[in-house]
Interface confidence: low
């Protein structure tokens, strides 16, 4: 059982709440507010929770709050990837997904959030202090990473509040000049809000466009950013890392990755149906359990793959140019 709550999303007042003139006057402030809240330094959020049904599993949610396009997501545990952390999954919006044991299923939930399920390790008790990190590479912001862990006092089934970028850092120089461009707009917004402070404040309403929007225990600017962007959280179930680190993939193959051509997105097919397809347009992702390919580049599946379709929220787009094959 999952316990989730709805984060209220900022919405412009509906017509009829005020006079037509008042509504028109408030359109610009709300547009500017959205821009001001979402502009500037991007953020990565991470949410960790434990599943009540599987005490050895966690749910982790990661997302990117920024306007750029995401080119790569790396999920790790035990610390930042490449700095003591161990990679659990790598997700690319066009080229597919690769995961490592004990990851069970990595997937895109939205255009800017991902999910990962980790197989229960069978440990007697989950490590509530395990740190999970998500690193988002995006253009033009650069690379941003945040980590989070389950609060020690968390009960099974309860989610920890999203932690926006506790160790946020920019690995690459991001193009953040848009903040300066919007500075005037933000100042103007404040001016307008001061002028309108005698009016009733607009209501905070649950977002109608994000039914899976996360619950937070407190309203904070980071949540405001999400709400304004209508970015729902992604779900990641993870299990505690065993002390020995010798975790085997539950189905025999420690890693797999694959991508499904757009034309196959409407009907699940076995590997034979699309194993030799040409470079596909970006469409959907398929999780192929143990479908690790490499006979000099292409690996036959260890076992019969189980197919799970996840539509790419960004829609089909042709891949950029021919690329080499080993």
């Amino acid at each position: 059982m999952r316990t989730e709550a709805q984060v209220p999303a900022l919405q412009p007042p509906e017509p009829g709440l005020e006079g037509a003139m008042g509504h028109r006057t408030l359109v610009l402030p709300w547009v500017l507010l959205t821009l001001c809240v979402t502009a500037g330094t991007p953020e990565v959020w991470v949410q960790v929770r434990m599943e009540a049904t599987e005490l050895s599993s966690f749910t982790i949610r990661c997302g990117f709050l920024g306007s750029g396009s995401i080119s790569l997501v790396t999920v790790s545990w035990g610390g930042p990837n490449g700095a003591g952390g161990t990679t659990l999954a790598v997700l690319h919006p066009e080229r597919g997904i690769r995961q490592w044991a004990p990851a069970r299923q990595a997937r895109w939930e939205t255009q800017s959030s991902i999910s990962l399920i980790l197989e229960g390790s069978g440990a007697s008790s989950p490590c509530a202090n395990t740190t999970f990190c998500c690193k988002f590479a995006s253009f033009p912001e650069g690379s941003w990473e945040a980590c989070g862990s389950l609060p020690p006092s968390s009960d099974p089934g309860l989610s920890a509040p999203p932690t926006p970028a506790p160790i946020l850092r920019a690995d690459l120089a991001g193009i953040l000049g848009v903040s300066g461009v919007l500075l005037f707009g933000c100042v103007y917004l404040l001016h307008l809000l001061r002028r309108h402070k005698h009016r009733p404040a607009p209501r905070l309403q649950p977002s109608r466009t994000s039914p899976q929007a996360p619950r937070a225990r407190a309203w904070a600017p980071s949540q405001a950013s999400q709400a304004a962007l209508h970015v729902p959280y992604a779900t990641i179930n993870t299990s505690c890392r065993p002390a020995t680190l010798d975790t085997a993939h539950p189905h025999g193959g420690p890693s797999w990755w694959a991508s499904l051509p757009t034309h196959a997105a409407h009907r699940p097919q076995g590997p034979a149906a699309w194993a030799s397809t040409p470079i596909p347009a970006r469409g959907s992702f398929v999780s192929v359990e143990n479908g690790l390919y490499a006979q000099a580049g292409e690996r036959p599946p260890h076992t019969g793959p189980g197919l799970t379709l996840f539509p790419d929220p960004r829609g089909p787009r042709a891949m950029e140019g021919p690329l080499g094959v080993r």
Epitope: S71, L172, S259
Partner: antibody, heavy 129, light 107 residues
């Protein structure tokens, strides 16, 4: 066949920095990961970090975090590794290495760190006062 | 970090002998393992990738096997030009790590 040509040997003072370059020719520079690996005299290999140019994302070994910076200039197909706060323990041969091409997964190219198929000739860095 | 334990650290064999080197990973790395040959003063040369795949152009007397945590590299018939140090390398997880090397000499 892709080739990697590195800059010449360097002699540095403790506390200074060194920047080693690695120029690629004969292949698509951005099509895979580039790693920097060092080998101290008579020792084994130590991965310092890497970059995947097509993603613009870098990864560093914890031991070198904050001291190493890996960059690329795609216009010249050159990768760079800068190591700061040098000590005598940084005396080593520094190699750049990369996958020859991206491997394909069911027809789809997938870039990450794999076997190092192409290596530079190495750059000897000596740190001495 | 994943530790790669390579053994033996050195060995001496006669021309024509079958030579076997082992590499053990501290955790499951699937088949994300490669083997390199390095001659003195030279850069390493990739021989085997993905645990058992022979790189194009490399002599078929070199072979690799194994999966998970235990891997083996074999030279079926040692030749004088095979005198070198051999290294295993895992690329299943970051940071990438290498074995300590096995120096192969001829008796």
């Amino acid at each position: 066949q892709m080739q990697l040509v590195q800059s010449g040997a360097e002699v540095k003072k403790p506390g200074s920095s060194v920047k080693v370059s690695c120029k690629a020719s004969g292949g698509t520079f951005s099509s895979s990961a580039i790693s920097w690996v060092r080998q101290a005299p008579g020792q084994g290999f130590e991965w310092m970090g890497g970059i995947i140019p097509i993603y613009g994302i870098t990864d560093y070994a914890q031991k070198f975090q904050g001291r190493v910076t890996i960059t690329t200039d795609e216009s010249t197909s050159t990768a760079y590794m800068e190591l700061s706060s040098l000590t005598s323990e940084d005396t080593a041969v520094y190699y750049c290495a990369r996958d020859d091409t991206a491997r394909r997964v069911r027809g789809v190219p997938y870039y990450y760190y794999y076997a190092m198929d192409v290596w530079g000739q190495g750059t000897t860095v000596t740190v001495s006062s | 970090d994943i530790q790669m334990t390579q053994s033996p650290s050195s060995l001496s064999a006669s021309v024509g002998d079958r030579v076997t080197i082992t590499c053990q990973a501290s955790r499951d790395i699937s088949d994300s393992l490669s083997w390199y040959q390095q001659k003195p003063g030279k850069a390493p040369k990739l021989l085997i990738f993905d645990a058992s795949n022979l790189k194009t152009g490399v002599s078929s007397r070199f072979s690799g096997s194994g999966s998970g945590t235990d891997f083996t590299f074999t030279i079926s018939s040692l030749q004088p030009e095979d005198i070198a140090t051999y290294y295993c390398h895992q690329y299943d997880n970051l940071p990438l790590t290498f074995g300590g090397g096995t120096k192969v000499e001829i008796k």
